[in-house]
């Protein structure tokens, strides 16, 4: 999916008002210095591509993020403010329902959500030069 035509300001507002808080809640009890940010993004569409990938694609050691509150809200924001995104999710939703797993917070998941926090922060500051 190409995130170029999304309404970035509305997605940013949703992140600031609610998604960011859910990410913090998920990470509660973890030191902010515990994980190094290894995933980066260069512009807003690229950031959303990386955010979608880390949020919804199961990875080794962390298969359960998609049912977390921040993930549900991310999915809603993308469906509402990214043209045509919802139709790409019809089949994906059916597949996710089939493979729904018990939510388990592993260290790998905490690391992944830490990466997500970094990507979202970068999304909110699109004019900053890459380090």
């Amino acid at each position: 999916y190409d995130f170029t035509n999304c309404d970035f300001e509305k997605i940013k507002a949703a992140y600031l008002s609610t998604i960011s808080k859910d990410l913090i809640t998920y990470m509660s009890g973890t030191k902010s210095t515990e994980f190094n940010n290894t995933v980066s993004c260069s512009n807003r569409p690229h950031c959303l591509t990386e955010i979608q990938s880390l949020t919804f694609n199961p990875t080794a050691g962390c298969a359960s993020l998609a049912k977390e509150m921040f993930a549900m809200k991310t999915k809603a924001a993308l469906a509402i403010w990214c043209p045509g995104y919802s139709e790409t999710q019809i089949n994906a939703t059916q597949a996710m329902k089939k493979r729904r797993k018990r939510k388990v917070t592993t260290n790998k998941c905490l690391e992944q959500v830490s990466q997500l926090q970094g990507l979202w922060r970068r999304f909110n500051r699109p004019l900053l030069k890459q380090q």
Epitope: N5, D7, A13, S17, A76, A79, I80, G84, S86, Q89
Partner: antibody, heavy 120, light 107 residues
């Protein structure tokens, strides 16, 4: 089963405001956005805007920006649409309709409609 | 905003005949079109979603097709209860918009 029950008909004077409610039951309220669509007598359907309880935010059609407010009370699973500075051409049936925001993504259930008549 | 144009405005047919309703978008919207039926004094009812997906409880004489800018709703054999107004709607991008409707009336 899924039900959306709207408040009763209203008669308002030009310049007044109206607040229509839509009580939802039979599903998880926050899994769906609530859209508002109106239909003037003998006319087609017009999308006014939506309130997304999951994100606690709204999005309105340009035409209604500044004159409409959509809200919801998640504790009672009730959505509200307030339209201000009413004019005679706001006379219409106002519908609420739910739409999934994390699945389905379509207006699959509608309220029965609320007739709002604006007349001096 | 995306404009949807439905044609014809009115379709006069007899029960048992085939009805073909058209909906054209002002820009490509992939498959993000849904079809609704509305009878006098009633709320719209969803018939087809995402261009061709059927809804449980809707008779299989209703079918949809198309993608991009051109979409079609077909009623294979009209039943007396099918005479109504039909609307297409796009949810590709906000603001969501409806076509102006096609009235299917008894000839």
């Amino acid at each position: 089963q899924v039900q959306l029950v709207q408040s009763g008909a209203e008669v308002k004077k030009p310049g007044a405001s109206v607040k229509v409610s839509c009580k939802a039951s039979g599903y998880i309220f926050t899994d769906y956005a609530m859209h508002w669509v109106r239909q003037a007598p003998g006319q087609g359907l017009e999308w006014m805007g939506t309130f997304i309880p999951l994100l606690d935010t709204s999005d309105y059609a340009q035409k209604f920006q500044g004159r409409v407010t959509m809200t919801a009370d998640t504790s009672t699973s009730t959505a509200y649409m307030e339209l201000r500075s009413l004019r005679s051409d706001d006379t219409a049936v106002y519908y609420c309709a739910r739409m999934g925001v994390t699945h389905s993504y379509v207006m699959d259930a509608w309220g029965q409609g609320t007739l709002v008549t604006v007349s001096s | 905003e995306i404009v949807l144009t439905q044609s014809p405005g009115t379709l006069s047919l007899s029960p048992g005949e085939r009805a073909t309703l058209s909906c054209r978008a002002s820009q490509p919207i992939s498959i993000s079109v849904h079809w609704y039926q509305q009878k006098p004094g009633q709320a719209p009812r969803l018939l087809i979603y995402f261009a061709s997906q059927s809804i449980s409880g809707i008779p299989d004489r209703f079918s949809g097709s198309g993608s991009g800018t051109d979409f079609t709703l077909t009623i294979s054999r009209l039943e007396p209860e099918d005479f109504a107004v039909y609307y297409c709607q796009q949810t590709f991008s906000l603001p969501y918009t409806f076509g102006q409707g096609t009235k299917v009336e008894i000839k």
